[in-house]
């Protein structure tokens, strides 16, 4: 069995699960949280948490909004110590071996361990490791930045491109552009799609004489990445007199395969590496983050990693009552599972973080998008929330109808910086920007009625389309500043929330067996396509298809 | 803590073999790149063989063809073995790791090879 850490196979075993039950059906569906705040002039006190950073700026957590009270949030901590999430958090903070069906690690955690305390997997100590692969990206990013790295003409390197996918490519991407403020030595551009337009928009834009390929596959096999690193060093070659000897001035590699690397052209000096026990997700701490330190510099790197650093002592230090992450997990499984809800919105209401839902759905959905415990069984409840999300206030203006009005309950977090890096016409753009954060956190809440919409004039067959029920949950985040501190520690805050749901649901939140499948069969459909002859291997459907393409392509 | 145990040397005569162990433990092996280096008596140490963490192999000019170097991950161990000894190749050995990512490197205590009649 790979049920060595938990010593129950579902949740609904857990006598705390049927109580949340019984609570649900007779308080939870029914509570108003508009009169929750009438009975309890401390709601707000009670229920909002303040982290503070390593640096001593701070992120509000506003909890508040969401429909539990005392007796909830109390039963679901009791669902969390049955569950036994806080030994399961352990272990993983201990290097033991919690992707059970991989027999991995899962030590993303030890890579943003700044403090340089033993952190052991099998028996090692990975922390000289891993400041050691620090040390290197330091040396090789401020070489590069500084313009004492030339390219083969001997100018300087302007513009740096990371070809990766999935956790080599979101990541990074997401990163580079919530820190944008912080750059301006280099450009960044990142080629993920498979899609020939991908690589060749990007190549239109860069000089073959001061660009820098990284190319971001551990194992330095991923179909897309390798195909789109082919391309872009074909060109580079028919760019540059065809010398191949040019290539370690302009390419590094992002990974442990040092005899691919090789053969590819690059120099294994180049060739920054990570361990196992580092998941694709949850490698933007690792050396998938060079492009990061290349655009925003090392010393800013570094603070990102102290953030989620700080998140991390948190969390492994924090009672259970005042423990952020684990709250914010607990209410996803209480919306997920008792009310029903599929779906977890995130809204920055902030431009620099417009790539950040993307980067959650990922981590979120690839981690708890499972429907088999680690006892082997399937579930009999809801797992996995769809993630979604875009900017306010833009958001504001397309699904926000439906969070505010439609169906379905649809649990929110918005996100909002007080202070902008941008506080232009005498900040009258963050002002207004933060007028909105608040309000549709309080129109969620609160809501109006069909008395307060005959009030305002309206009258007949118009008043229910003006009506807002409200009651819908919202958890609003402020932080003071988006620095990389700030940014490392949100992250940080999402996978252990993340990691909270999936110890409650007792899956497997580190493996991506559902990536596997589409993979093979695209290999063999790949064959196919090399050929004029008509398929008739598939089902009717599949062969209907390639067989249209083969005739238009 | 990390070990880098060397094994293997002793006395043997000219034309001889004998085969070096280092046992490797406070590692990450699989990412090293592993190497053997000597130092004989009032001389500098010069490096022997090298073996990357894929498995490509470099030596020395005075050793190629009669040295072999390999690596065991699974057992964290890298060998030499050493064949058509002769007098010059008497010196203290040393087992030696290098990080494959970053600047971190490690040193065993070295095992003595004398070649003599």
């Known amino acids: 069995s790979n049920n060595s850490f938990t010593n129950f196979k579902l949740a609904t075993e857990l006598p705390a699960w049927s109580k949340l039950q019984k609570i649900y059906e007779s308080q939870g569906k029914t509570l108003s949280v508009k009169q929750e705040f009438q009975k309890d002039a401390k709601r707000f006190e009670k229920l909002n948490k303040t982290f503070t950073n390593y640096d001593g700026s701070k992120i509000l957590f506003d909890y508040s909004k969401n429909l539990v009270n005392d007796e909830i949030i109390a039963a679901l901590i009791e669902l969390a110590k049955e569950a036994n999430v806080t030994g399961l958090r352990d272990a993983m903070f201990k290097g033991e071996h919690i992707n059970s069906t991989e027999d991995r690690a899962v030590y993303h955690v030890a890579l943003r361990n700044r403090a340089n305390k033993p952190m052991y997997v099998d028996g090692v100590n990975v922390a000289p490791e891993v400041d050691s692969v620090l040390k290197h990206m330091k040396e090789f990013s401020e070489q590069v930045r500084s313009g004492e790295w030339k390219g083969y003409t001997g100018k300087k390197i302007t513009d740096v491109v990371n070809i990766g996918i999935g956790g080599s490519d979101l990541g990074p991407v997401m990163v580079t552009e919530a820190l944008k403020h912080y750059a301006g030595v280099l450009d960044v551009h990142f080629v993920s799609n498979i899609d020939g337009t991908h690589i060749a928009e990007t190549l239109k834009v860069v000089d073959p004489e001061t660009t820098l390929f990284l190319i971001a596959s551990k194992t330095f096999t991923t179909a897309e990445t390798i195909t789109n690193a082919n391309t872009a060093k074909n060109w580079f070659l028919s760019k540059t007199g065809n010398d191949p000897s040019h290539i370690a001035k302009h390419f590094a590699a992002l990974s442990t395969n040092e005899t691919e690397v090789a053969k590819f052209g690059i120099d294994t000096k180049n060739m920054f590496g990570f361990e196992s026990w580092v998941g694709g997700r949850y490698s933007v701490w690792s050396a998938i983050g060079l492009s990061v330190a290349l655009y925003i510099g090392y010393d800013n790197f570094e603070a990102f990693l102290k953030g989620a650093e700080a998140v991390d002592n948190h969390f492994t230090q924090t009672p259970l009552e005042d423990n952020i992450p684990l709250l914010g997990g607990l209410l996803s499984v209480w919306y997920n599972n008792f009310f029903g809800a599929q779906t977890h919105l995130v809204a920055p209401f902030d431009q620099y973080l417009h790539r950040f839902p993307a980067y959650l759905q990922q981590l979120s959905m690839e981690s708890n998008g499972k429907s088999v415990t680690r006892g082997n069984v399937f579930t009999d409840y809801s797992t996995g929330s769809i993630l979604f999300g875009e900017p306010a206030t833009n958001a504001q203006h397309s699904f926000f109808q439906l969070v505010h009005q439609g169906t379905k309950l649809i649990p929110s977090d918005f996100i909002l910086a007080a202070q902008s890096h941008n506080p232009i016409e005498n900040k009258l753009h963050q002002k207004m920007l933060a007028s909105n954060f608040f309000a549709q956190a309080e129109a969620l809440m609160v809501g109006k009625d069909e008395e307060q919409v005959k009030a305002e004039g309206a009258t007949g067959g118009l008043v229910p389309h003006k009506v807002f029920s409200g009651n819908r949950p919202t958890t609003s985040i402020l932080a003071q500043k988006i620095t990389p501190a700030t940014l490392g520690a949100l992250i940080a805050y999402y996978e252990h929330v993340t990691f909270t749901e999936g110890a409650i649901w007792n899956i497997n939140s580190f493996d991506q067996w559902g990536v596997e499948l589409g993979k093979v069969l695209a290999k063999v459909i790949g064959k196919e396509l090399d050929n004029s002859s008509t398929i008739s291997t598939h089902d009717a459907s599949t062969n209907g298809l390639i067989n249209q393409f083969k005739e238009w392509m | 803590q990390v070990q880098l145990v060397e094994s293997g040397g002793g006395l043997v005569q000219p034309g001889g073999s004998l085969r070096l162990s280092c046992a490797a433990s406070g590692i990450s092996f699989h990412s090293y790149a592993m190497g053997w280096y000597r130092q004989a008596p009032g001389k500098q140490r010069e490096l022997v063989s090298t073996?990357?963490?894929?498995?490509?192999?470099d030596y020395a000019v005075s050793v190629k063809g009669r040295f072999t170097i390999s690596r065991d991950n699974a057992k964290n161990t890298v060998y030499l073995q050493m064949n058509n000894l002769n007098s010059e190749d008497t010196a203290v050995y040393y087992c030696?790791?290098?990080?494959?990512?970053?600047?971190?490197?490690?040193w065993g205590q070295g095992t003595q090879v004398t070649v003599s009649s």
């Open positions: 030696h790791s290098q990080y494959a990512y970053g600047p971190l490197e490690y």
């Open positions: 073996i990357t963490t894929g498995g490509s192999t």
